[in-house]
Interface confidence: low
């Protein structure tokens, strides 16, 4: 079994990158974004069992304390480790503008 | 109340810094750490309701999609925004050493 990267809960259950297709309406952006009309939102979804993709020492501590005190300390959480930029064409008072967002789409994931 | 920082679930329910007292045995460190014998572990615990302490655009998107597809997209999660360093006195083959860990204690929290 892989140290730190084998999912003990069964295939596909642990923290990894997923894509969710969303319209501007879904995102609440229809009033200020022109394009794209639909976004492939990459996000981190899945469980973080013991030491799976632990981001750092804090995540390791959290796992240990969650095992001891599950009602007090939550398990680590699956969150982005880094992001991919995305360009939105936005509505402005004078027309349109291109804006790059660096923190919109998850690139890869870890547990923290 | 500050926009994005008012907890609609009631005082203390939302994402914030907590301290959990843990022994070296609790942490599984007894075989390699000499001191401190007990650690005041600061960690981020609490709910992340709509737009509460949203770390970035990704967190805002996650909130929107969680509202639409709660079975598919999880709510944002309360995680450290930054860390405080901590010095551990470790056992070595020849005696002891001081080691600073930069990613051990949460300093402040946000939702992502």
């Amino acid at each position: 079994a892989r140290n730190g990267d084998h999912c003990p809960l069964g295939p596909g259950r642990c923290c990894r990158l997923h894509t969710v297709r969303a319209s501007l309406e879904d995102l609440g952006w229809a009033d200020w974004v022109l394009s794209p009309r639909e976004v492939q939102v990459t996000m981190c979804i899945g469980a973080c069992p013991s030491q799976f993709r632990a981001a750092n020492m804090h995540a390791q501590i959290k796992t240990s304390l969650h095992r001891l005190k599950p009602d007090t300390v939550p398990a680590p959480c699956c969150v982005p480790a880094s992001y991919n930029p995305m360009v939105l064409i936005q509505k402005t008072d004078t027309g349109v503008s291109l804006q790059t967002y660096d923190d919109l789409l998850a690139k890869d994931c870890h547990c923290i | 109340a500050r926009n994005g920082d008012h907890c609609p679930l009631g005082p203390g329910r939302c994402c914030r810094l907590h301290t959990v007292r843990a022994s070296l045995e609790d942490l599984g460190w007894a075989d390699w750490v000499l001191s401190p014998r007990e650690v005041q572990v600061t960690m981020c615990i609490g709910a992340c309701p709509s737009q509460f302490r949203a770390a970035n655009m990704h967190a805002q998107i996650k909130t929107s999609l969680h509202r639409l597809k709660p079975d598919t997209v999880p709510a944002p999660c309360c995680v450290p925004a930054s860390y405080n360093p901590m010095v551990l006195i470790q056992k070595t083959d020849t005696g002891v050493s001081l080691q600073t860990y930069d990613d051990l204690l949460a300093k402040d929290c946000h939702c992502i």
Epitope: R2, D5, H6, C7, G10, P11, G12, R13, R16, L17, H18, T19, V20, R21, T42, I45, K107, D108 | D71, T72
Partner: antibody, heavy 117, light 107 residues
Framework: QVQLQESGPGLVKPSETLSLTCTVS?????????WIWIRQPPGKGLEYIGY???????YYNPSLASRTTISRDTSKNQFSLKLSSVTAADTAVYYC??????????WGQGTLVTVSS | DIQMTQSPSSLSASVGDRVTITCRAS??????LNWYQQKPGKAVKLLIH???TLHSGVPSRFSGSGSGTDYTLTISSLQPEDFATYFC?????????FGQGTKLEIK
């Protein structure tokens, strides 16, 4: 024994929609794995098209996303690929596969789709 | 996308030879590297996943190693059934991407 079998027309006209189905036996597609489409143009490397996951999540390679739809029919234990507005560049052997733990452990034999008028 | 560069693109060898195929990623892929075998008209077979873990039923003459960006597939003693095309694939960052393949032929 897990088996996957691709089916669909071998010839599609330019600008039309390519439609393929993958029939899975020996394992329920309603379980945890990712169900994937991959293609290989003649004489070229493999290209990942995308997946469908049991929870209803899909992923499409950004280079093909605007033309791609992957869906599931759990009652028939099948998943499907639709690729719209095809051109000659979409001529390839199309494979379906299963990804259970960051690797594709079972593949279909592949089906050649030619785009030509 | 992560680019996977595989070498050599073709290789002639004899039964009993030791063969090594390499794969280089354009960025660190954290050991999420898989190796596959492809034969004409047959389904692709997974040989090795996560750099070095042999898939069930794969002979022990196949082995994998590497870390970071550089990975290797080794066949310790070639058998007649091993002549095929081999390709690597990274599973660290979507979209998963593949090497161009190495065609292993009989000398």
């Amino acid at each position: 024994q897990v088996q996957l079998q691709e089916s669909g027309p071998g010839l599609v006209k330019p600008s039309e929609t390519l439609s393929l189905t993958c029939t899975v036996s020996g394992f329920s597609i309603n379980r945890d794995c990712y169900w994937i489409w991959i293609r290989q143009p003649p004489g070229k490397g493999l290209e990942y098209i995308g997946y469908t996951f049991y929870s209803g999540i899909t992923y499409y390679n950004p280079s093909l996303a605007s033309r791609t739809t992957i869906s599931r029919d759990t009652s028939k234990n099948q998943f499907s690929l639709k690729l719209s507005s095809v051109t000659a560049a979409d001529t390839a052997v199309y494979y379906c596969a299963r990804d259970c733990d960051y690797a594709m452990d079972y593949w279909g034999q592949g089906t050649l789709v030619t785009v030509s008028s | 996308d992560i680019q996977m560069t595989q070498s050599p693109s073709s290789l002639s060898a004899s039964v009993g030879d030791r063969v090594t195929i390499t794969c280089r990623a354009s960025q660190d892929i954290s050991n999420y590297l898989n190796w596959y075998q492809q034969k004409p008209g047959k389904a692709v077979k997974l040989l090795i996943h996560y750099t070095s873990t042999l898939h069930s039923g794969v002979p022990s003459r196949f082995s994998g190693s590497g870390s970071g960006t550089d990975y290797t597939l080794t066949i310790s003693s070639l058998q007649p059934e091993d002549f095929a095309t081999y390709f690597c694939q990274q599973g660290n960052t979507l979209p998963w991407t593949f090497g161009q393949g190495t065609k292993l032929e009989i000398k």
